[in-house]
């Protein structure tokens, strides 16, 4: 009786989002599963998701460690189930991932608008400073806590009754922008991080317009 | 080749500590998982936990959690189970395993056997 | 937990006669492993991943099944292959062994 045949995997693919990690490849196993490993440039491959069925493994305990590192995978691939086999010979076929440096590489969330306040012909709109899965001191960072200063934020707003938008700009969490007094305005942001080469910006957020729930508005 | 070879067999009292070793060779340690098992006499076998050498990372089974302390300590390559508040429960032959190809618990070493009497 | 229920708990066999044990679990798993253990030695990984047999084991034995139905057969008993032997799983956490069967030679 021979061994069975197994398929290396092909197409590793880093999914990541404000951190959270998924590495996703290709062929859906037949008669085979995949134990995946992950190792920076100087450690050791550490084993993760052992022989699963499943293309993806979720690789962000492993990289929330240091989002700074630069991180490499692999997918190890094994006969297995009902299949003709005879022992095991050598070492399984394996295929790497590219390298992952999540500091640099992990997309920004989708942001929202936490909330916005007028204050006669101030508008104050706050970001919602979103939960990451990085952990310091047994307590979850924020993303403004990872990122600092590298991360800016975008506001793209505009009178309801018109379709010319203005930007602001703010390191922080929070724009203080003026307004025309009477007027309901629209808002969306979108995260930057701008000192960087790809996944430079996220998508923008919902469009949040004074007048409804989230709003605040004071006649001053 | 990969060998686990672990400390000689303990007798112990009731209430007390005990913990047990195993030194690796013919491998990178801090590379691999590392299981303990424990087997009591004439019965079958018990996953207790693990421990992945290169970083400390470590999972146990909830019945043991409180009961078993896995370390590892690199510079020897030597991996640790302390068991505390001993009973004639825990008499038993305990193994180190380590995972390897095809399966988590390819390799063994040879138990040891942990007898608790007052 | 899965729990693993293996039968015969006892069983003997002549040399030469075909030899089938089987492991039920308590709930669907997705590949069972078998382990060899003789007295006062360790177990030793017999088969992998359902049907893969481990290195240096024998061509008489096989592994088969899927779901909640699992087992072992040995085409022609032989006195080295008397043991006890081991199912295990770990598609859930924690992995869990069977009672294990004892395999007697006649």
């Known amino acids: 009786s021979g061994t069975t045949n197994t398929v290396a995997a092909y197409n590793l693919t880093w999914k990541s989002t404000n951190f959270k990690t998924i590495l996703e490849w290709e062929p859906k196993p037949v008669n085979q599963v995949y134990t995946v490993q992950i190792s920076t440039k100087s450690g050791d491959w550490k084993s993760k998701c052992f022989y699963t069925t499943d293309t993806e493994c979720d690789l962000t305990d492993e990289i929330v460690k240091d989002v700074k590192q630069t991180y490499l995978a692999r997918v190890f691939s094994y006969p297995a189930g009902n299949v003709e086999s005879t022992g095991s010979a050598g070492e399984p076929l394996y295929e790497n991932s590219p390298e992952f440096t999540p500091y640099l590489e992990t997309n920004l969330g989708q942001p929202t608008i936490q909330s916005f306040e007028q204050v006669g012909t101030k508008v104050n709109v706050t970001v919602e400073d979103e939960r990451t899965l990085v952990r310091r001191n047994n307590t979850f960072l924020s993303l403004r806590d990872v990122f600092g200063k590298d991360l800016i934020y975008t506001l793209y707003y505009w009178k309801s009754s018109s379709s010319g938008k203005k930007t602001a700009k703010t390191n922080t969490n929070e724009f203080l922008i003026d307004v025309d007094k009477g007027e309901n305005y629209c808002f969306s942001v979108q995260a930057v991080i701008p000192s960087r080469t790809v996944n430079r910006k996220s998508t923008d957020s919902p469009v949040e317009c004074m007048g409804q729930e989230k709003g605040e508005f004071r006649e001053i | 080749q990969v060998q686990l070879q672990q400390s000689g067999a303990e007798l112990v009292r009731p209430g007390s500590s005990v913990k047990i070793s195993c030194k690796a060779s013919?491998?990178?340690?801090?590379?691999?998982?590392m299981y303990w098992v424990k087997q009591r006499p004439g019965q079958g076998l018990e996953w207790i936990g693990q421990?992945?050498?290169?970083?400390?990372?470590?999972n146990y089974n909830e019945n043991f959690k409180g009961k078993a302390t896995l370390t590892a300590d690199k510079s020897s390559s030597t991996a640790y189970m302390q068991l505390s508040s001993l009973t004639s429960e825990d008499s038993a032959v305990y193994f180190c395993?380590?995972?390897?190809?095809?399966?988590?618990?390819?390799?063994w070493g040879q138990g040891t056997l942990v007898t608790v009497s007052a | 937990q899965i729990v693993l229920t293996q039968s015969p708990a006892l069983m003997s066999a002549s040399p030469g006669e075909k030899v089938t044990m089987t492991c039920s679990a308590s709930s669907s798993v997705s590949y069972m492993y078998w382990y060899q253990q003789k007295p006062r030695s360790s177990p030793k990984p017999w088969i992998n991943l359902t049907s893969n047999l481990a290195s240096g084991v024998p061509a008489r034995f096989s592994g088969r099944g899927s779901g909640t139905s699992y087992s072992l057969t040995i085409s022609s008993m032989e006195a080295e292959d008397a043991a006890t032997y081991y199912c295990?799983?770990?598609?859930?956490?924690?992995?869990?062994f069977g009672g294990g069967t004892k395999l007697e030679i006649k």
């Open positions: 295990q799983q770990w598609s859930y956490n924690p992995p869990t």
């Open positions: 421990i992945y050498p290169g970083d400390g990372d470590s």
């Open positions: 013919g491998y990178t340690f801090s590379s691999y998982w």
């Open positions: 395993t380590r995972e390897g190809y095809g399966n988590r618990f390819a390799y």
